[in-house]
């Protein structure tokens, strides 16, 4: 239970009395003064907003509120040269083009400062060429296309539909294809919901709607130019030619409206099946090309975007811990959006602020945490986790000596459904026990607790009576902490219901139509559910900057490194003889999470029965719990991925936004019956086998009793 | 109040040229495609030009291609048709009109019209 060192409030009510300051209206305000005007990364308004910040934490109560700033790559589109694209007839006329901006929602017609839809990072060029429909731009569907439908993308320009992965892996995708250009679209088979209005009459995505994004591929590099070091005053920085992540060909977003007008014209191949088929009244066909009367119509993308090198804000609050002040416990969220940020990510900040208010009333009652909380509010986020990323690599010596547990706020909603969770398996008891002990939002779950409506509307796939959570993958600002600096992460956000809403994310996601009024009227009028993401991100902090032993439970880790083992075992038995022939085993990793298993359990029992009154004791205890997340660090990094360094997790090399189990040996196998070369190839899964065994024995043994 | 209100008609020599202007209130210009639409005396309805909310794209009857031009100036919530080279079949009422779906990328049906302005071509 938590602890009542250094406080006036008697234990029982530490919690109580943090979840109890949490206010709906609260959070509501907040959200409405963090959405009237973009706050674009590199912009005067999220400067200011980032001054604004640091001035309401101070007066909310923290020991101290610093501003860090960076001076990192970002994208913008040429304010006097829009980005567009054309169909062209034969003579070169444009004889149709894309929009240059969204229609402006009811009541923001006047704001100025609207960035127009564009694909942050893309280079500069005008090509023209014929047009292929690849779907989703996943690697399957290129290998749809180019293996079995014969078809060859190179020197085409190339239409894919967002949704499914994230929309840097399409990019990269085409280019490894052979395209010159990328058109991304939102198809309202993934953006409207059926029976739903679009905006502002509903939460659907309009047809003249676009998402913006960038289409990096860092691999959890941060700045582009500064890779591993911060982007300080006397950075040294690379060329453009040497940044890392920046695509080479020019992509573009467009809405379905406009999406309709180059469809509709499409000939070549049919679509191979009906997974290739979106909603609009077009034939899907893939190309190459216009079909019969308009074949000589081609397409012309212009893109006049361009990367400049520009100074951005973290806001960073301290609450000292008043009996580990070297212990940190980050809760952290970004504030740059493409535009309002209504829900993306705003939502988010707005519990952020209410966090940080509830924490400092508590602090000005005479309480203290425990250990230290550092709370963020990161920049950049939009741009590739660039303000959290610069950060920690600026901090990481202090980091991963002193780094308990990352829990990250972005957007509190995509949905009003049920509760998600994604999160390092040590958090797994802190989950279930706290969201136990809250009240459920939920419709048809008055008096029942978060956890029994979470578990009934997302069972665990594995567990019954449990609620699923999942491996944390990437694409947002807890990234660094996990990925590359082995603190154990968490997030928990509201989510739609998915077995009904096929569709990817939210419809109006990085959209003009993401504004305070899509919350208040279609999401979350009451705000309950914005209270609960609070209660919930709010109490995990809470919990582990004040329990007196860390609510970390090692076997749960124990028990998903035996279901990881199992499973990458069956997917390299799907080549018996290979295995055979090149005497791959999966012995050692399977004996390596065996003996992290008893290990762990014996480290339990200890954990039950030792002398908490002996701070070395406790604080050696906890140390080991800390470190065991660390422990699953290699220093070396993944393949080709030195930011990505978790052995047991990390971003799938497919799609960042999704988490991948032992990703080394899971990349080495991916496609291993096409690569020309199979000796080497096995030999690659033998060292990546090699590598986790002994990163889980290594794990096991920081676990054993130290002397 | 919604509505909209053309002006600039007149009287004017074949060969001539007028420039129409069409004051939108109570709706945001910005959000919608545009029309001139004309009926000549006698006559039926017939569509001119057209252009998109955010000015990308601009359709005209095949009857005033290279001829008439269609701007709009959404900070001052207007819309224009210059029309040059003017002929005596140009004589008609002209209405600016506004299309009846957000953002739409070709013109779709009308739910606000002018009162219209005349345009005479006569020598």
């Known amino acids: 239970k938590s602890s009542n060192e250094a406080t006036n409030i008697t234990p029982k009510h530490n919690m109580k009395a943090f979840l109890d300051e949490l206010k709906a209206e609260n959070i509501k305000k907040f959200l409405y003064n963090f959405t009237q005007i973009p706050h674009l990364a590199g912009t005067e308004q999220n400067f200011q907003l980032a001054k604004q910040i640091q001035s309401q934490w101070k007066e909310f109560g923290l020991d101290s509120v610093e501003l860090a700033h960076y001076d990192v790559l970002l994208s913008y589109p040429n304010k006097t040269h829009p980005n567009y694209i054309s169909i062209i007839n034969e003579d070169g006329n444009e004889i149709f083009n894309t929009s240059l901006f969204e229609p402006p929602p009811p009541g923001y017609e006047n704001v100025s400062d609207i960035v127009p839809p564009f694909s942050a990072f893309s280079p500069q060029g005008m090509p023209e060429g014929d047009l292929v429909y690849v779907n989703y731009a996943r690697t399957e569907d290129f290998f749809k296309l180019e293996r079995d439908m014969k078809i060859n993308c190179s020197g085409k320009i190339v239409i894919a539909r967002y949704g499914k992965v994230f929309r840097g892996n399409k990019v990269k995708n085409a280019q490894l294809a052979g395209a010159k250009g990328v058109i991304l679209y939102s198809d309202p088979a993934d953006y409207f919901a059926p029976g739903v209005k679009s905006y502002p009459d509903g939460w659907n995505l309009p047809g003249g709607g676009v998402q913006r994004g960038n289409i990096l591929n860092l691999n959890g590099a941060g700045d582009p130019l500064t890779p591993g070091y911060p982007a300080n005053e006397y950075a040294y920085r690379r060329g453009i030619a040497e940044a890392v992540g920046l695509p080479s060909i020019p992509v573009h977003p467009i809405g379905y409206y406009d999406a309709q007008k180059l469809l509709e014209k499409m000939g070549g191949s049919a679509p191979p099946d009906s997974s290739w088929r979106g909603s609009l009244k077009v034939p899907y066909n893939v190309g190459p090309g216009f079909t019969g009367n308009f074949s000589t119509q081609k397409v012309k993308m212009h893109i006049h975007s361009t990367n400049e090198v520009t100074r951005i804000y973290n806001v960073i609050g301290t609450l000292r811990g008043a009996v580990e002040p070297d212990r940190y416990v980050i809760l952290g969220g970004h504030r740059d959006s493409w535009v309002f940020g209504g829900i993306d990510p705003q939502s988010g900040a707005a519990v952020v602020h209410e966090i940080v208010r509830s924490f400092g009333t508590l602090k000005k009652e005479g309480w203290r945490p425990r250990r230290t909380i550092l709370f963020a509010s990161w920049d950049a986020e939009e741009f590739g986790l660039l303000g959290s990323t610069e950060w920690a690599e600026e901090n990481s010596r202090l980091l991963q000596e002193r780094g308990v547990a990352y829990i990250n706020a972005d957007s509190s909603i995509e949905g009003n459904y049920t509760l998600r969770v994604d999160c390092t398996p040590l958090m797994y008891s802190l989950v279930h026990n706290l969201t136990k002990e809250l009240k459920s939002p939920d419709e048809g779950f008055e008096g029942k607790s978060l956890y029994e409506s979470w578990t009934k509307k997302s069972p665990s796939p594995e567990f019954s009576g449990m609620p699923r959570i999942s491996k944390l993958g990437s694409g947002n600002d807890f990234e660094v902490f996990f990925q590359r600096l082995g603190i154990a992460s968490g997030r928990a956000r509201y989510t739609k219901n998915w077995e009904t809403n096929k569709f990817s994310g939210y419809p109006l996601y990085h959209s003009v139509y993401e504004t305070y009024e899509l919350v208040e009227k279609f999401y979350d009028p009451m705000f309950k559910y914005h209270l609960t993401v609070a209660q919930v991100r709010g109490g995990m902090v809470f919990e582990l900057a004040n329990s007196i032993v860390l609510p970390f439970d090692c076997r749960d880790y124990a028990v998903v490194l035996r279901k990881y083992a199992d499973k990458i075992y069956s997917i390299s038995m799907k080549h018996p003889q290979e295995m055979k022939t090149y005497s791959v085993s999966f012995d050692s990793l399977f004996s390596a999470v065996k003996n992290f298993t008893e290990i762990a359990s014996k480290f339990s029992e200890r954990l039950q029965d030792f002398d908490k009154s002996n701070p070395i004791v406790l604080r050696m205890m906890n140390d080991q719990l800390m470190f065991l997340e660390r422990a699953f660090i290699d220093p070396l990094g993944l393949p080709d991925r030195p930011f990505y360094r978790h052995v047991i997790y990390a971003p799938s090399s497919h799609n960042k936004y999704a988490g991948e189990s032992f990703p080394g040996i899971y990349d080495a196998l991916f496609d291993i019956e096409s690569k020309v070369d199979p000796s080497k190839a096995w030999g690659e899964v033998k060292r990546q086998i090699y590598v986790a065994a002994f990163t889980v024995q290594a794990a096991a043994e920081t676990l054993s009793e130290v002397a | 109040e919604v509505q909209l209100v053309e002006s600039g008609g007149g009287v004017v020599r074949p060969g001539g040229s007028l420039r129409l202007s069409c004051a939108a209130s109570g709706f945001p210009l910005i959000s919608y495609g545009m029309n001139w639409v004309r009926q000549a005396p006698g006559k039926g309805l017939d569509w001119v030009a057209f252009?998109?909310?955010?000015?990308?794209?601009?359709y005209y009857a095949d009857s005033v291609k290279g001829r008439f031009t269609i701007s709009r100036d959404n900070s001052k919530n207007t819309l224009h048709l210059q029309m040059n080279s003017l002929r005596p079949e140009d004589t008609a009422v002209y209405y600016c009109?506004?299309?009846?779906?957000?953002?739409?990328?070709?013109?779709?049906?009308?739910?606000?019209w002018g009162q219209g302005t005349m345009v005479t071509v006569s020598s």
């Open positions: 009109a506004k299309d009846r779906i957000v953002g739409a990328r070709v013109p779709d049906a009308y739910d606000i």
């Open positions: 252009i998109t909310y955010d000015g990308s794209n601009r």
